[in-house]
């Protein structure tokens, strides 16, 4: 097995990626400028910390979380970084074009970088379902399509349903999950004989995946509060997210032990279930009025996540060709739905408490918003999957799925690992 990049990809990837980067640089040159009105530099430097937290989540958290494959850990981390870097650039431009362009220039602020990082995070969640089965050229396509689809979804939801930044960005969990699952469904599924070991996890990569989970766990409150507009809402979001993820860790570890006949704890369950509370609480994190509610939500989310990790991989592996350790897709799809349902319940309580008959209308709109997110995710995911199947991308052969040696130079290694 040659450790060289296939010839065609070696020709295609640098040309494709560098041409795209040159195009992005030109777009930035002609259409963007920095916000020049920085009166209070000290305050703005402080607000950069939220953006920094998001970058840590994306680069280290999601980068390492997806690195548990025995023979695909390098690619997981580095490809994640590549997608993040590309995704942020395109997301800044796209958000600017969609929201500011009538004025002729896109003004880049710390907030626009924050938004762009969160948009790029969507791709990093989705890609968990396809990592190891695609090359970098294909991932570039996935980044461009998904960031574009999410940007347009957010714009449509904002205009039709009158939602703010936080609300329309919190559809990211459901959107990213369904996008990733629909892309995975389009890709070639069967693993030929003799390659099954490659999608198994190994101890050291699993440890790095746990490190990724820890980073995500630590910074999830920043993610859920990043787009909220007032200190009191942010405070609520941080507290509720913290309580939810704290309880989901306890639930994940004990639930994982409970689910095993010998009472052993599964690394895979824990990797994803520790984050369950943060996903489930995301949409309504600023609204939940007391800690016990956030904790109950964390408990329920942890149980759903462990249950899902136990019973869904078989189905996902058969139908979508997603390996057992890539459980972020179905995990986020279930937990994202749970979060949306909780929000709808809170909306109903608010309407009932206000004492008028608008409940059906409010619920209908919320369901419409959620349905739109899922439909756009599925449609754009299927479109991406079809695009990725085109011969021009020279996708890795099924026999070379989940193999770092297809993409990386390992001077100290022989042909095999």
């Amino acid at each position: 097995m040659s450790s060289k990049y296939p010839r065609s990809v070696r020709r295609c990837l640098p040309l494709w990626a560098l041409t795209l980067e040159a195009a992005l640089i030109l777009l930035f040159y002609f259409f963007t400028h920095y916000d020049a009105s920085l009166e209070d530099q000290k305050g703005l430097v402080a607000s950069y910390q939220v953006g920094q937290d998001l970058t840590v989540m994306a680069a280290i958290g999601l980068g390492f979380l997806t690195s548990s494959f025995r023979r695909h850990s390098w690619s997981s981390v580095a490809f994640n970084l590549f997608m993040l870097a590309l995704g942020v650039q395109w997301a800044i431009l796209l958000d600017g074009f969609l929201s500011q362009f009538p004025s002729g220039k896109v003004v880049i602020t710390l907030f626009s970088i924050r938004l762009a990082t969160m948009s790029a995070l969507s791709v990093l969640i989705s890609v968990d379902a396809v990592l190891g089965k695609v090359n970098l050229a294909q991932l570039v396509v996935m980044v461009l399509v998904e960031v574009t689809a999410l940007g347009n979804l957010r714009m449509v939801i904002s205009n039709i349903f009158n939602t703010d930044y936080h609300m329309n960005m919190m559809h990211i969990y459901v959107f990213a999950a369904y996008f990733g699952l629909s892309v995975a469904w389009c890709l070639p599924k069967p693993l030929p004989e003799g390659t099954e070991d490659k999608d198994q996890t190994a101890t050291i990569p699993s440890l790095s995946a746990m490190l990724g989970a820890l980073f995500l766990w630590m910074f999830w409150p920043s993610f859920n509060s990043a787009l909220l507009r007032s200190p009191i809402e942010r405070k609520n979001a941080v507290f509720n997210t913290y309580y939810a993820v704290a309880v989901s860790v306890v639930t994940a570890i004990s639930g994982s032990s409970l689910a095993h006949p010998q009472g052993k704890i599964s690394k895979t369950y824990v990797h994803s279930a520790v984050l369950a509370g943060g996903v489930a609480v995301g949409t309504s994190c600023h609204l939940i009025p007391s800690p016990w509610l956030a904790m109950v939500l964390g408990l329920v989310a942890g149980l759903i996540s462990v249950g899902g990790a136990k019973y869904l991989p078989g189905c996902c592996n058969r139908v979508l060709g997603i390996p057992h350790s890539s459980i972020m897709g179905y995990n986020f799809s279930l937990l994202g739905l749970l979060g949306e349902i909780i929000y709808i319940v809170l909306l109903v309580l608010d309407t009932v408490g206000a004492g008028n008959g608008m409940i059906g209308f409010q619920v209908l709109l919320s369901i419409g918003e959620l349905s739109l997110a899922i439909v756009i995710a599925l449609m754009s995911g299927l479109l991406t999957g079809l695009l990725l199947n085109l011969k021009i991308w020279k996708a890795p052969h099924e026999a070379k799925y989940f193999d770092d040696q297809v993409f990386w130079k390992f001077p100290h290694l022989a042909v095999g690992f």
């Epitope: 305050g43 703005l44 607000s47 907030f111 039709i160 200190p231 609204l287 909306l347 206000a354 409010q362």
Partner: antibody, heavy 125, light 106 residues
């Protein structure tokens, strides 16, 4: 006592620039979103711009996008509105307003609970 | 969301019950505020979150509604209530105001 005091208004020619200030006192300025709202002679109120409590984000009405810039200096408890390429239709009384966020039954609600007295900007040749 | 107020103007007597309506083009939940504006003064907040009375506002003012239809009611009109009344949505940017209802005392 909460006070908002606008200044910097006056008569200016079309195409020129003007900078409005709003000095805040009596509350913790750095924890509130601040807005500019205007009222043209004989017309209704029109929202102009907002800046978030930490200055990280700004939003503008379509009519002023690309020409007006809102900013704040939390260390000086001051809000600003830089108005460039002024037009006759920008003639109005400009108010700064504080946005307070309050809990409804469950959802959060936003209200302009304090306003300044306004400063008149006249764009005329 | 565009806000349409009605009526454009109205004239009523002291002691009358007056109702002003505001209709939104989109669902704005309960994020609607009502202001009273007198010439030469700053606008004054009367009702926020559709039905909550702002501190210091007389109890004759009340608000109701949710979603797209809202009303401001003055239960017993007083001479000092002569002013222009605006509704305003604060759910999403750009914030918008209704065109105003001018209330005169007969």
């Amino acid at each position: 006592e909460v006070q908002l005091l606008e200044s910097g208004g006056g008569v200016v020619q079309p195409g020129r620039s003007l900078r409005l200030s709003c000095a805040a006192s009596g509350f913790t300025f750095s924890t509130y979103g601040m807005h500019w709202v205007r009222q043209a002679p004989g017309k209704g109120l029109e929202w102009v711009a907002v800046i978030w409590f930490d200055g990280s984000n700004k939003e503008y009405a379509d009519s002023v996008k690309g020409r007006f810039t809102v900013s704040r200096d939390n260390s000086k408890n001051t809000l600003y509105l830089q108005m460039n390429s002024l037009r006759a239709e920008d003639t109005a009384v400009y108010y700064c307003a504080r946005e307070e966020v309050v809990r409804g039954v469950i959802l959060w609600s936003r209200k302009f609970d304090y306003w300044g007295q306004g400063t008149l900007v006249t764009v005329s040749s | 969301a565009e806000l349409t107020q009605s009526p454009f103007s109205l004239s009523a007597s002291v002691g009358d019950r007056v109702t002003i309506t505001c209709r939104a083009s989109h669902n704005i939940y309960r994020s609607l505020n009502w202001f009273q504006h007198k010439p030469g003064e700053a606008p004054k907040l009367l009702v926020y979150a559709a039905s909550s009375l702002q501190r210091g506002v007389p109890t004759r003012f009340s608000g109701s509604g949710s979603g797209t239809d809202f009303t401001l009611t003055i239960s017993s009109l007083q001479p000092e209530d002569s002013a222009t009344y605006f509704c305003q949505q604060s759910v999403t940017f750009p914030y918008t105001f209704g065109q105003g209802t001018k209330l005169e005392i007969r």
